[in-house]
Amino acid sequence: MNGRVDYLVTEEEINLTRGPSGLGFNIVGGTDQQYVSNDSGIYVSRIKENGAAALDGRLQEGDKILSVNGQDLKNLLHQDAVDLFRNAGYAVSLRVQHRLQVQNGPIGHRGEGDPSG
């Protein structure tokens, strides 16, 4: 018997310093490119190896980026969001939403993510 899949949503402020090759991640989403159904938000699609985000370690693929340097990313076209990041300066503050999958199963059920056993 499989348990119900729930999600634990947390928010975090991540301060990144732009490295030699930038911030080091890719995004998808926007009002013209919905990545999640009924959500035109901006999501992290790739963390680039050895980039600033990867070295910092907190930003994860699948995270939703809510704001950049305090500027809301709601209702932005995809390219406008890209341009906002590119023009964000040397020190960049990201407000992000992490969505952690939590397995709620019957007693004794171990979710796939459980490292034990």
């Epitope: 930038g22 080091g24 790739r46 680039k48 190896e49």
Partner: nanobody, 126 residues
Framework: DVQLVESGGGLVQPGGSLRLSCVSS????????IGWFRQAPGKEREGVSC???????YYIDSVKGRFTISRDNAKNTVYLQMNSLKPEDTAVYYC?????????????????????WGQGTQVTVS
């Protein structure tokens, strides 16, 4: 299984035209930037043109005005129309796909690392 398959290469005379196609499968094409790269014998691979997931096109200076990139999301295909071909355009042409848009640079930047690559198609201008 992810696949990128290039076609449309061949032998053409200087001043002639070719249209390369890159057909993809195994991933959600709409969210990927697609780039065309080329490698001539004894030379480094270079980015030629790329198109973002929302259709913004980029070109290196040497092909501007001669090459046109386009995408058809319904067919999971990107095209590179090459006109006024020159002997220096001779190379193996590869397409590559990258998930999303880099927040740092255009898809032609040397820093850009693409996720998936095709096997290439030979273009000879002679």
């Amino acid at each position: 299984d992810v696949q990128l398959v290039e076609s449309g290469g061949g032998l053409v005379q200087p001043g002639g035209s070719l249209r390369l196609s890159c057909v993809s499968s195994g991933f959600i094409f709409d969210y990927y930037a697609i780039g065309w790269f080329r490698q001539a014998p004894g030379k480094e691979r270079e980015g030629v043109s790329c198109i973002s997931s929302v259709g913004r096109a980029y070109y290196i200076d040497s092909v501007k005005g001669r090459f046109t990139i386009s995408r058809d999301n319904a067919k999971n295909t990107v095209y590179l129309q090459m006109n006024s071909l020159k002997p220096e355009d001779t190379a193996v042409y590869y397409c590559a796909a990258d998930f999303g848009s880099s927040v740092d640079s255009t898809c032609l930047s040397k820093e850009q690392r693409f996720d998936y690559w095709g096997q290439g198609t030979q273009v000879t201008v002679s």
